[in-house]
Interface confidence: low
């Protein structure tokens, strides 16, 4: 049983972190099922809709406002008891986002990490936030909370995540809250994808027509493996963005992606990684680095016909 003997279990779907104007389903699980229940909020800013109302199975709350932020409990229907209701459930904190300007989220040393390493996710803002919250997409549990540190007109918090394992990969966002309104959070930071590498066999990376080409000659980098990767990711040393392509099964039973780099203008060191659709943020070991050299006149950039991925979006599926 999720609650105690006479204690229901209150949960929120999809998450306890709800955007202002969004909706959240509150479910009161009691005696192995969803019976009639009543909801109440544990502070003075009561949400009038609850007063004297009885709900069945779940209650969709919304569109939420800052006043909805706070701690909720429920009581399950218990007709034969003295009061007619169970003991109060566990407390459930609902946090409402979108109340202040968004903070920024950075990863140190970077968002691409080896399994077992630790990453510091730094959330910062010029708004004097008292607390910062870090939330991973798709997780229904409460976000991690840290007290903000203030320095030189900036408030920030450093969340240490690690040792990294597949379950910790994913899309992170952070939020801030100001004094005296701890559950009224800011707008979310831009999403930051934390990618874990080193979990599967490395693919091989090759260049056509070869790793040394004439300036202006078309170059294609091929990433392939016997492993049935769904997606390949190509990164270039010194570039923030990776390129990604769907893997294509070949007649020799390998899985391959061909990255056309266009006319060669200058060289660089490339690596590729494989990943599976089910775990888009968990990548293979890196291929051996491939140094592409260009003879002739190098220019400052290499045009890319493949669209580089945005800062985030790595952890979304390729449709």
């Amino acid at each position: 049983l999720m609650g105690g003997q006479d204690k229901p279990f209150l949960s929120a779907r999809p998450s306890t972190v709800v955007p202002r104007g969004g909706h959240v389903a509150l479910q009161c699980h009691y005696r192995r099922g969803f019976n009639n229940f009543m909801l109440y909020k544990e502070d003075r800013s009561h949400v009038p809709i609850f007063h004297g109302r009885i709900f069945q199975e779940s209650f969709i709350m919304g569109p939420v406002t800052p006043a909805h932020a706070g701690t909720y409990r429920c009581r399950g229907s218990r007709p034969h008891s003295l009061t007619g209701w169970s003991a109060p459930s566990n407390p459930l904190v609902i946090m409402v986002t979108g109340n202040h300007r968004k903070p920024s989220l950075l990863a140190h040393p970077g968002p691409l990490l080896k399994s077992g390493e630790t990453v510091i996710l730094q959330c910062w803002s010029d708004v004097m936030f008292e607390h910062f919250f870090l939330h991973r997409e798709g997780i229904s549990e409460d976000p991690s909370r840290l007290v903000g540190q203030i320095h030189d007109g900036v408030s920030k918090a450093n969340f240490s995540i690690g040792p990294l394992m597949p379950v910790l990969a994913g899309t992170y966002r952070c939020y801030g809250s100001v004094p005296h309104s701890p559950y009224q959070l800011s707008a979310p930071s831009d999403p930051l994808d934390i990618v874990i590498t080193g979990l599967y066999e490395k693919p091989s990376l090759s260049a056509q027509p070869g790793p040394t080409v004439q300036a202006g000659e078309n170059v294609t980098l091929s990433c392939s493996s016997w492993s049935s990767y769904d997606i390949y990711h190509l990164s270039r040393e010194g570039e923030a963005h990776e390129r990604r392509l769907r893997a294509v099964p070949k007649v020799n039973r390998t899985f391959q992606a061909d990255f056309p780099l266009g006319p060669a203008t200058h060289g660089g060191t490339y690596r590729c990684f494989g990943s599976f659709r089910a775990l888009p943020c968990v990548w293979s070991n890196s291929s051996d680095p491939l140094l592409v050299s260009v003879t002739g006149n190098p220019s400052s950039s290499w045009p890319s016909p493949t669209e580089p991925s945005s800062k985030s979006g790595i952890c979304r599926h390729l449709h």
Epitope: H108, T118, I120, Q122, M128, E130, S144, R145, L146, V147, Q149, I150, H151, D152, N158, F159, S160, I161, G162, V178, P179, H180
Partner: antibody, heavy 120, light 107 residues
Framework: QVQLVQSGAELARPGASVKVSCKAS????????MHWVRQAPGQGLEWIGY????????ENNRKFKDKTTLTADKSTSTAYMELSSLRSEDTAVYYC?????????????WGQGTTVTVSS | DIQMTQSPSSLSASVGDRVTITCRAS??????LAWYQQKPGKAPQLLVY???NLADGVPSRFSGSGSGTDYTLTISSLQPEDFATYYC?????????FGGGTKLEIK
């Protein structure tokens, strides 16, 4: 250089109140949170709570919620901790400490400590 | 609240010995841990922060290690001035609790 200088020892009767001060110098007072730590005779360290001198926001260890009041005076760069309804078990050395900055910051500077003795 | 369990509570050792003190958190504190040294009648002094980083001016014979719930402070070769009490403290959300302390005495 950063310094936290605390007020002198206090002798108080049970039921009385005392106010301990912590004067900060050598840095921007409002840019760091100030924390208070207690050490009873022969015992370990206990975190009491903190104040953000910039906003006045405080957060206390539940154990000390009704015992301590934390305040700060920005004009004098001084943090205060008031201990109320004193009992003999409140006899201890009380430290102020600054929470540093950077990655996963610790208490980087401490006051010298103020001994509070509660005795009838 | 997160509990910090420090062991041993006391330890006798000689100058030149290698000494290890451990601290276990009741849940993952993600390296949000500091170690302090305290001598009688004095305020604690920071030794290690973020589990593994040596504070300014701390001799290199001190080192911190660990992750998750288990952390260690090591003194590679004890010096006379190292005999003191050592505390760990977590910073993974308030209250920032300390370990019970380890008193390091001369054998």
């Amino acid at each position: 250089q950063v310094q936290l200088v605390q007020s002198g020892a206090e002798l108080a009767r049970p039921g009385a109140s005392v106010k301990v001060s912590c004067k900060a110098s050598g840095y921007t007072f409002t840019s760091y949170t100030m924390h208070w730590v207690r050490q009873a005779p022969g015992q370990g360290l206990e975190w009491i709570g903190y104040i953000n001198p910039s906003s006045g926001y405080t957060e206390n260890n539940r154990k000390f919620k009704d015992k301590t009041t934390l305040t700060a005076d920005k004009s004098t760069s001084t943090a205060y901790m008031e201990l109320s309804s004193l009992r003999s078990e409140d006899t201890a050395v009380y430290y102020c400490a600054r929470l540093g900055k950077g990655l996963l910051p610790p208490f980087d500077y401490w006051g010298q400590g103020t001994t509070v003795t509660v005795s009838s | 609240d997160i509990q910090m369990t420090q062991s041993p509570s006391s330890l006798s050792a000689s100058v030149g010995d290698r000494v290890t003190i451990t601290c276990r958190a009741s849940e993952n504190i993600y390296s949000n841990l500091a170690w302090y040294q305290q001598k009688p009648g004095k305020a604690p002094q920071l030794l290690v922060y973020a589990a593994t980083n040596l504070a300014d001016g701390v001799p290199s014979r001190f080192s911190g290690s660990g992750s998750g719930t288990d952390y260690t402070l090591t003194i590679s070769s004890l010096q006379p001035e190292d005999f003191a009490t050592y505390y760990c403290q977590h910073f993974w959300g308030t209250p920032y609790t300390f370990g019970g302390g380890t008193k390091l005495e001369i054998k």
